[in-house]
């Protein structure tokens, strides 16, 4: 897979492949994988990709199911890159506060908060 | 501060306090704090709260600015709790795939993806 494929297109393709191979993937009825109990997905990327690793090791490879796992690996690479960018730029307090305000604003409006 | 305050109310109050104390917080003109370079805030909670810690250590405490940092500490506690819930429940592959599909769907529609 060319890594030049835009991440947004990669995600779309992966969703389609996930749907295509669902029957094959759920064939192992005894396998149990940790599933987050909330919908703030970004907090759980580590566990999600650990789960994908478990699933891959239990799935017969070949054909486009390999492409699915390759895609998921590229998505992980993208997210790892984003995580690296969390502390890259050292900025004035002013800018940190603007980012913090935006973070809390998003938390206020978009997060699924269970108290 | 009673920890029983709903997290959503806590976030709202913290936004207000952040605005109130902005001038005091930015008084240190030479301080530099890492600022994430993207808007996928949930990926960067660790760095954000490290930054808050740096800011707190450089800010003269007293009055409601203390309440601001206490609130932020409670928000961190909430997020840490959410992170613990990422791997708590072991579920069938079927259920993991549902979560994965939802994660990719959210990534597809809501994440800010720069390729």
């Amino acid at each position: 897979i060319p890594t030049e494929i835009p991440t947004s297109a990669l995600v779309k393709e992966t969703l389609a492949l996930l749907s295509t191979h669902r029957t094959l993937l759920i064939a192992n009825e005894t396998l149990r994988i940790p599933v987050p109990v909330h919908k703030n997905h970004q907090l759980c990327t580590e566990e999600i990709f650990q789960g994908i690793g478990t699933l891959e090791s239990q799935t017969v490879q070949g054909g486009t199911v390999e492409r699915l796992f390759k895609n998921l690996s590229l998505i992980k690479k993208y997210i790892d890159g984003q995580k690296k960018k969390c502390g890259e730029e050292r900025r004035r307090v002013n800018q940190f506060l603007d980012y913090l305000q935006e973070f809390l604003g998003v938390m206020n409006t978009e997060w699924i908060i269970e108290s | 501060i009673p920890t029983e305050i709903p997290t959503s109310a806590l976030v709202k109050e913290t936004l207000a306090l952040l605005s109130t104390h902005r001038t005091l917080l930015i008084a240190n003109e030479t301080l530099r704090i890492p600022v994430p370079v993207h808007k996928n805030h949930q990926l960067c909670t660790e760095e954000i709260f490290q930054g808050i810690g740096t800011l707190e250590s450089q800010t003269v405490q007293g009055g409601t600015v203390e309440r601001l940092f206490k609130n932020l500490s409670l928000i961190k506690k909430y997020i840490d709790g959410q992170k613990k819930k990422c791997g708590e429940e072991r579920r069938r592959v079927n259920q993991f795939l549902d979560y994965l599909q939802e994660f990719l769907g959210v990534m597809n529609t809501e994440w800010i993806i720069e390729s």
């Epitope: 890259e88 730029e89 050292r90 900025r91 004035r92 002013n94 800018q95 603007d98 980012y99 305000q101 935006e102 604003g105 | 001038t23 930015i26 008084a27 003109e29 030479t30 530099r32 600022v35 994430p36 370079v37 993207h38 808007k39 800010i112 720069e114």
Partner: antibody
Framework: QVQLQESGPGLVKPSQTLSLTCTVS??????????WSWIRQHPGKGLEWIGY???????YYNPSLKSRVTISVDTSKNQFSLKLSSVTAADTAVYYC?????????WGQGTLVTVSS | SYVLTQPPSVSVAPGQTARITCGGN??????VYWYQQKPGQAPVLVVH???DRPSGIPERFSGSNSGNTATLTISRVEVGDEADYSC???????????FGGGTKLTVLG
């Protein structure tokens, strides 16, 4: 390498609104590490900061221009814009857009705007 | 609001040292940035955070800042250094950017 390019009319009539757009290439305007700023320079004079905007929409304006200035951002086009209302001949200047981290990192080449009837 | 004062002009012979000052109330507590601007071009950062040079800027350019004065020093001045030089700080009480009025450096030929 981030590049910025100003565009807009070079001539504006007095009392009208000056509108300029800055297109960012080689980087994303959604980069939370930067503010996006406008600066102007009257002929033969020093630099004058007009204002800046954060990706979230937070804006900061020069107090002397605040009542007439609006800066906005369009992340889908990777652009940000300046509007300066009720212009007079005193607004004739070279207008620069720039990215602003801890300092002004990248600048456009500047565009001369003349206010004249 | 915060004000920065620069001399309108400084003249120096090639090979000599030029010093351009930037005055402001307690400027030593702020970080100062210096920009070089040649005719018809956009400004270029030559010193940031009082005394740090961006990559590509010759070692001849240096800065200092204390008390009420920041100084940009250009040693072994060359003809190509002739330009306008502006200082800049942040006014933290308002989150505003402040520029000095600029200093024209003339290299005497």
């Amino acid at each position: 390498q981030v590049q910025l390019q100003e565009s807009g009319p070079g001539l504006v009539k007095p009392s009208q609104t000056l509108s300029l757009t800055c297109t960012v290439s080689g980087g994303s305007i959604s980069n939370a590490g930067y503010y996006w700023s406008w600066i102007r320079q009257h002929p033969g004079k020093g630099l004058e900061w007009i204002g800046y905007i954060y990706y979230s929409g937070s804006t900061y304006y020069n107090p002397s221009l605040k009542s007439r200035v609006t800066i906005s951002v369009d992340t889908s086009k990777n652009q940000f814009s300046l509007k300066l209302s009720s212009v007079t001949a005193a607004d004739t200047a070279v207008y620069y857009c720039a990215s602003l981290g801890n300092w002004f990192d990248y600048w456009g080449q500047g565009t001369l705007v003349t206010v004249s009837s | 609001s915060y004000v920065l004062t620069q001399p309108p002009s400084v003249s120096v012979a090639p090979g000599q040292t030029a010093r351009i000052t930037c005055g402001g109330n307690n400027i030593g507590s702020k970080n100062v940035y210096w920009y070089q601007q040649k005719p018809g071009q956009a400004p270029v950062l030559v010193v940031h955070d009082d005394s740090d040079r961006p990559s590509g800027i010759p070692e001849r350019f240096s800065g200092s800042n204390s008390g009420n004065t920041a100084t940009l020093t250009i040693s072994r001045v060359e003809v190509g250094d002739e330009a306008d030089y502006s200082c800049q700080v942040w006014d933290s009480s308002s989150d505003h950017v402040v520029f000095g009025g600029g200093t024209k450096l003339t290299v005497l030929g």
